[in-house]
């Protein structure tokens, strides 16, 4: 069986087993044939007529091989005393099993009195003469444990007390717990303990590319079975468990820490160039911020903000913009404003200086608007709004920015007051409005700001017009939009008009003209 090591197996011996028998006329060494008429060797005794039989059959010396407890598996047939005439007083149906330990082969010089009795063995099934037909002999198998053993070897002996008995085979074996890997710990084979209840503690060694989570231990039972696994090993970073081993993460996969988890596919925009990767390297132009976990996707700096518009009010300017179309895969976007003063031309600009005031602040702006005050009157300014995220400072590329140029003055146009809808289609709306009451100069253009209702913070669009009417196209059918208009002069932009809501036409259903 699995986990059993044979010290003796007579079924593998061809011919006489060479055992010691005494006295004479007791046990006989006899070659028989089995049920299939194959030759087998047996030891038989059938001294059933005389009382007080005491016939001994002793094995050769069996080296212990380190076993503390061994098992004797005896296969035998025993004839029913009732099948033999006239022997009821003298015939027995049991025999005794004994053992003797010694540190060397004692040859023929062993004595009955030295042996220790293991057990009296009876047949589960004896047979009568009627069972002999077609050699249907009832084979009995009995197993007995012997131990604890301490000397280098031992003998087993069968004592016949008057039975009609044939010993067909004897297998002496010890049990061991087989070498195995459990919880990624390798346990070497272990010989079982000295008695039937003992447990032998064995410490496991972590397999290659694994490490202890808790000290791995198991206990080898007397039956040769591993019991009570304690502790375990886990695969190291870069390795995952596969069939009791730790295998390197394949290309394109990684594992950042020791543990039970499997290798994970590299996050988006990253790769592993070698097996057993503990992290995945970011693709070109993608980065991982210092606090990003290895499981986070690699990201890149955002594109420039869009729809940057300015509103000049004397020596102040309000800047508004929409978030970048490409946030770079991150949500931690803030904005920085760069102010440049251009006294002569837009090609010759300089920093605005410390007197300029930014509300709420110049850098790390969370919202997409800014008031810049304390500007010089009648001065050209260039404002750059750059979007920044958690990896912008890791990129060597210059930051993308939206630019707006303005000229300060003392008076921008007043608010456009009257605005009305001229026509609304499914995807377009035509608007009409009046000039501001105080243009404060020549109106250079009008700016129409529009967005889906309640979505101004998410996205809005602008359109420029040079007259007091405009058609806004590319709208969604059946959708409510908000429109605002303002005028721009060389002095800057006026305030936006009050919001006007218009709903685009619903799409007409198609009619099936088939009959």
């Amino acid at each position: 069986g699995r986990g059993e090591v044979n010290l003796l197996d007579t079924s593998t011996i061809h011919g006489d087993w060479g055992w010691l028998t005494y006295p004479a006329h007791g046990w006989d060494s006899i070659n028989e044939v089995d049920e299939s008429f194959r030759p087998i060797h047996t030891y038989q005794v059938c001294n059933v007529m005389s009382p007080n039989q005491n016939n001994w059959l002793r094995t050769n010396w069996v080296p212990r091989d380190g076993a503390r407890r061994v098992y004797a598996e005896i296969k035998f047939t025993l004839r029913d005393c009732n099948s033999i005439p006239g022997v009821l007083g003298t015939c027995k149906e049991t025999f005794n099993l004994h053992y003797l330990e010694s540190d060397r082969d004692l040859g023929a010089s062993t004595q009955e009195s030295q042996f220790l009795k293991i057990d009296t063995i009876a047949a589960d099934e004896s047979f009568t003469g009627a069972d002999l037909g077609v050699r249907r002999l009832k084979l009995n198998t009995e197993v007995r444990g012997v131990g604890p053993l301490s000397k280098r070897g031992f003998y087993l002996a069968f004592q016949d007390i008057g039975a009609c008995l044939a010993i067909l085979s004897l297998r002496i074996y010890y049990k061991k717990c087989p070498a195995m890997v459990r919880n990624l710990a390798a346990f070497s084979e272990a010989v079982t303990g000295a008695d039937s209840s003992s447990l032998v503690e064995v410490r496991g060694q972590c397999v290659r590319h694994s490490e202890e989570r808790d000290t791995p231990k198991m206990y080898c039972s007397a039956e040769g079975e591993w019991l009570v696994p304690i502790g375990k090993c886990v695969c190291s970073a870069g390795y995952e468990e596969r069939r009791d081993a730790c295998m390197a993460c394949e290309l394109g996969f990684y594992k950042s820490a020791p543990g039970d988890q499997l290798c994970a596919r590299c996050p988006p925009h990253s790769h592993s160039a070698t097996p057993a990767a503990q992290t995945c390297r970011c693709d070109l132009s993608y980065y991982r911020a210092a606090l990003d976990p290895p499981s986070a996707a690699c990201t890149r700096p955002p594109s420039a903000p869009v729809n940057l518009i300015s509103s000049v009010n004397g020596t102040s300017v309000t800047l508004e913009w929409a978030p970048p179309l490409d946030p770079g895969g991150r949500s931690d976007i803030t904005y920085n404003a760069v102010c440049r003063r251009c006294p002569w031309a837009l090609s010759h600009c300089e920093a605005c200086g410390s007197g300029t005031r930014f509300v709420p602040q110049q850098t790390s702006l969370a919202q997409a608007s800014l008031l810049v005050a304390n500007l010089l009157a009648h001065m050209n300014y260039s404002f750059w709004i750059e979007a920044v995220n958690g990896v912008s400072n890791l990129s060597p590329e210059p930051r993308s920015a939206a630019v707006v140029n303005i000229t300060t003055n003392q008076a921008a146009p007043s608010q456009v007051v009257v605005i009305r809808q001229e026509r609304a289609g499914q995807t377009s709306v035509s608007l009409l409005w009046q000039e501001p009451e105080q243009p404060n100069g020549i109106i250079l253009e009008y700016e129409i700001k529009y967005y889906e209702k309640d979505k101004e913070m998410q996205s809005y669009s602008t359109l420029k017009a040079v007259t007091t009417r405009a058609t806004v196209s590319g709208l969604k059918p059946g959708t409510r939009y908000v429109f605002q208009v303002r005028a721009r002069t060389s002095a800057g932009c006026g305030r936006f008009s009050q919001a006007m809501e218009v709903e685009t036409g619903k799409p007409r259903p198609r009619y099936d003209t088939r009959t």
Epitope: S50, P51, D131, C164
Partner: antibody, heavy 121, light 106 residues
Framework: QVQLLQSGAEVKKPGASVKVPCKAS????????MSWVRQAPGQGLEWMGW????????TYAQGFTGRFVFSLDTSVSTAYLQISSLKAEDTAVYYC??????????????WGQGTLVTVSS | EIVLTQSPATLSVSPGERATLSCRAS??????LAWYQQKPGQAPRLLIY???TRPTGIPDRFSASGSGTDFTLTISRVEPEDFAVYYC????????FGQGTKVEIK
């Protein structure tokens, strides 16, 4: 070696008695039963019965009761067949044979050389 | 009592040939059957017991089989010393012999 030794030929008159000895050697006499077999001239074998050498208890086959007696003297390892009131049809060779019981079956494994008993007036 | 019938009464074979002897019981004797060989002027010799078991010293050219009521003794290659009379014997509660089969030289 194991052997059974029987006495020489006997010639008896009708009505007389004869006691045929069978001396065993080479084994423990009381460990094996002893059987008796008759073979009339030119005829086959006839089993007469057997005796338990340990208890002395005899078993007789049909047709061999009354005039035939099995007995023992274990001190000299000898079995005896006594036939009384001899008849002419008792003329035969009488064999003693050791009975062997085994796990796999029984048989008469050792035979004496036979004693010819002739009954003639 | 159980009656054993042997056939044939006489079997003529040449040395080296195969000889097959039969023994039939009037009722089942299971495997409680023995075979004996008897040469002229000699005591019988046990050849087989337990229907098929050969005692130590019996040549392996002798083999036997059967159970219940039909039994066979086979001599695979008859040797000159095998010419003799062969008896079967059952050992139930009462023992009986068959009448014998004579194996003679052809």
């Amino acid at each position: 070696q194991v052997q059974l030794l029987q006495s020489g030929a006997e010639v008896k008159k009708p009505g007389a008695s004869v006691k045929v000895p069978c001396k065993a050697s080479g084994y423990t006499f009381t460990s094996r039963a002893m059987s008796w077999v008759r073979q009339a001239p030119g005829q086959g074998l006839e089993w007469m019965g057997w005796i338990n050498t340990n208890t002395g208890n005899p078993t007789y086959a049909q047709g061999f009761t009354g005039r035939f007696v099995f007995s023992l003297d274990t001190s000299v390892s000898t079995a005896y067949l006594q036939i009384s009131s001899l008849k002419a049809e008792d003329t035969a060779v009488y064999y003693c044979a050791r009975v062997r019981f085994t796990v796999y079956g029984d048989g008469m494994d050792v035979w004496g050389q036979g004693t010819l008993v002739t009954v003639s007036s | 009592e159980i009656v054993l019938t042997q056939s044939p009464a006489t079997l003529s074979v040449s040395p080296g040939e195969r000889a097959t002897l039969s023994c039939r019981a009037s009722q089942s004797v299971s495997s409680n059957l023995a075979w004996y060989q008897q040469k002229p002027g000699q005591a019988p010799r046990l050849l087989i017991y337990g229907a098929s078991t050969r005692p130590t010293g019996i040549p392996d050219r002798f083999s036997a089989s059967g159970s219940g009521t039909d039994f066979t003794l086979t001599i695979s290659r008859v040797e000159p010393e095998d010419f003799a009379v062969y008896y079967c014997q059952q050992y139930g509660p009462s023992w009986t012999f068959g009448q014998g089969t004579k194996v003679e030289i052809k």
